[in-house]
Interface confidence: low
């Protein structure tokens, strides 16, 4: 599991050459069943924010339970709350469930801070705001556990959408996604529109806000603008992807790229942060503070560890500078940028003392493990999981938050050389057994 | 059930080279951190360094950064130490083990296997 | 680097007595410290994460607490089979560091 501001919390202290047929959503590319146009029932099924996660309603067992389920791509184990715990109003209660099988087998799951522990079996599982299909899935009932669930966050299991290589208690354990696509017409694919609020929420309104979508099979067109760009999922763990520049209000960070994935880059949206390499996030902090410049902020805010906060409607959104990330492209010697503002990576908080005052969090913290594109960077876009084709698409979100001056932005091509070099890789001759 | 097992301890002169394996098995050898950490006699522990067999990236103590590498080899479970211009100070029972990505401990350890270097 | 320091270095117990070890780093650490249990010839074992988080199958009757500076290893009730060398570990930051090591001896 990945080191840092993850949740639940897991808090540590780490261009084409020009005539190129450009990798964007096209009526070119061939259909597939449900992969494309409109998907009612599933636009709205998330809700949370990004400092406590981003939820969805499953139903487990039969008579089916109701439960709010995390949606967490940097893990792949489908697990609930199965016991009383304070934190939660409700729980999978496996004695109710004709349809429960045991698997006779526990699994243990420490984080930095924190962990649980639960038994395996498996059940009946189907998504009320999602496909019409119902799927026999591996499910890790909770019976222990620290600093896992959130008080308030209103979610009472995680969903893991990664592959099945990071399963605990190994990769013998099927994701839920692999059971979904194999038991039905589901294609193999995934999108999440993650919609960050721009202000704090309180409780009463978290709980009645809307969180954003999680199209299951396909690409909604009405939850973004503009083309989607595809970068190469480098391996199926976790949703590695390979970064190959770093700019800050355009300013070239001038590291070498591979710093940038070391040791690894991934899509992660059960962590609220951008999370850097140390040494990377040292450089763009010290970027970032260059070019915010005209205000001075104590060093606890930069370490994600002090509010800043202004006069309601007063903060000073273009000192901050934007953002890219420059992502590998399909194409040979061929990348994309895409382009977050302030309002993505200052995360609001609410401030009892200073309710008044619009209250902020740097959300960009240091890493020991590789760099995570979390809710910060995803709150910006509309983000493909195409699993069947081995790669993760990158739209405008039609509900990214911005102000008149600057929008986040998915640009291309770029002319990028060596990109394969800015990826850390296995130092072994024969790289087939990484797919098997 | 974990196992690590190390091989390829032995009596080394000053200035020479030793390669030393661990074979890992019961568990997802990619989705771990493999660390080398050494025990001098009657001493304590000391980190020499990591991989992440999955992406290959590597880290190593100051006392032996440019002297030591490590490697891991996928196919086969096994991670390495390569350990060259060996001192009369690397004498020590050299463990490997393995670790979470987060947090930054050792889970399960080997036997250890032991590298004396005298002349 | 940072420096983990152990007290005491040893310490004679006596079974059913109550231990405590304490680490203190160099700086700032959160709580991320581990610690491990040795005994003679063999590899050490981890006993709790995250300063207080107790590690899988490990006995109840280990604790760990702190955060910042200054960490505790309690032994709540010492049993025969805990006479051993205890290690305490930073783990914020690369290189990963260890404390010099408390030695438990029967009494």
């Known amino acids: 599991t990945q080191h840092g501001i993850r949740l639940p919390l897991r808090s540590g202290l780490g261009g084409a050459p020009l005539g190129l047929r450009l990798p964007r959503e096209t009526d070119e590319e061939p259909e597939e069943p449900g992969r494309r146009g409109s998907f009612v029932e599933m636009v709205d099924n998330l809700r949370g924010k990004s400092g406590q996660g981003y939820y969805v309603e499953m139903t487990v067992g039969s008579p089916p339970q109701t439960l709010n389920i995390l949606v967490d791509t940097g893990s792949s184990n489908f697990a609930v709350g199965a016991a009383p715990h304070p934190f939660l109003h409700r729980y999978y209660q496996r004695q109710l469930s004709s349809t429960y099988r045991d698997l006779r087998k526990g699994v243990y799951v420490p984080y930095t801070q924190g962990k649980w522990e639960g038994e395996l079996g498996t059940d009946l599982v189907s998504i009320p705001h999602g496909p019409n299909v119902t799927v026999r899935a591996n499910i890790a009932a909770i019976t222990e556990s620290d600093k896992f669930f959130i008080n308030g966050s209103n979610w009472e299991g995680i969903l893991g959408l990664a592959y099945a290589e990071i399963a605990r208690p190994d990769d013998s354990l099927e994701p839920f996604f692999d059971s979904l696509v194999k038991q039905t017409h589901v294609p193999n694919l995934f999108s999440l529109q993650l919609c960050g609020a721009g202000f704090p929420l309180n409780q009463s309104e978290v709980l009645a806000s809307v969180g954003g979508s999680m199209i299951i099979g396909g690409i909604d067109h009405s939850l973004y603008t503009g083309s989607l760009w595809y970068t190469p999922i480098r391996r199926e763990w976790y949703y590695e992807v390979i970064i190959v520049r770093v700019e800050i209000n355009g300013q070239d960070l001038k590291m070498d790229c591979k710093e940038y994935n070391y040791d690894k880059s991934i899509v992660d949206s059960g962590t609220t942060n951008l999370r850097l390499p140390k040494k990377v996030f040292e450089a763009a902090v010290k970027s970032i503070k260059a070019a915010s410049s005209t205000e001075k902020f104590p060093d606890g805010f930069w370490l994600g560890e002090q509010l800043v906060c202004w006069q309601a409607g007063t903060t000073p959104w273009n000192i901050f500078p934007v953002i890219s990330l420059y992502l590998m492209g399909e194409v040979t010697n061929q990348s994309f940028r895409i382009t977050i503002l302030p309002q993505q990576y200052l995360r609001p908080v609410e401030d009892v003392a200073t309710s008044q005052d619009d209250c902020y969090k740097f959300a960009i913290s240091q890493s020991s493990t590789g760099t995570v594109m979390g809710a910060v960077i995803m709150e910006g876009f509309y983000v493909v999981f195409d699993r069947a084709r081995k790669r993760i698409g990158f739209a405008v979100s039609a509900c990214h938050v911005h102000d008149e001056f600057r929008t986040a932005a998915v640009e291309g091509p770029f002319v990028t050389l060596d990109m394969e070099d800015c990826g850390y890789n296995i130092p072994q001759t024969d790289e087939s057994t990484l797919m098997t | 059930e974990v196992q690590l097992v190390e091989s390829g301890g032995g009596l080394v002169q000053p200035g020479g080279s030793l390669r030393l394996s661990c074979a890992a098995s019961?568990?997802?050898?990619?989705?771990?951190?493999i660390h080398w950490v050494r025990q001098a006699p009657g001493k304590g522990l000391e980190w020499v360094g990591w991989?992440?067999?999955?992406?290959?990236?590597?880290d190593y103590a100051d006392s032996v950064k440019g002297r030591f590498t490590i490697s891991a080899d996928t196919s086969k479970n096994t991670a390495y130490l390569q350990m060259n211009s060996l001192r009369a100070e690397d004498t020590a029972v050299y463990y490997c083990?393995?670790?979470?990505?987060?947090?930054?401990?050792?889970?399960?350890w080997g036997q250890g296997t032991l590298v004396t270097v005298s002349s | 680097d940072i420096q983990m320091t152990q007290s005491p270095s040893s310490l004679s117990a006596s079974v059913g007595d109550r231990v405590t070890i304490t680490c203190r780093a160099s700086q700032d650490v959160s709580t991320a410290v581990a610690w491990y249990q040795q005994k003679p010839g063999k590899a050490p074992k981890l006993l709790i994460y995250?300063?207080?988080f107790l590690y899988s199958g490990v006995p109840s009757r280990f604790s760990g607490s702190g955060s910042g500076t200054d960490f505790t290893l309690t032994i709540s009730s010492l049993q025969p089979e805990d006479f051993a060398t205890y290690y305490c570990?930073?783990?914020?930051?690369?290189?990963?560091?260890f404390g010099q090591g408390t030695k438990v001896e029967i009494k």
């Open positions: 991989i992440s067999p999955a992406g290959g990236s590597t």
């Open positions: 995250s300063a207080s």
């Open positions: 570990q930073q783990s914020y930051t690369t290189p990963p560091t």
């Open positions: 083990a393995r670790g979470p990505f987060s947090p930054w401990v050792m889970d399960y």
């Open positions: 019961g568990f997802t050898f990619s989705g771990y951190a």
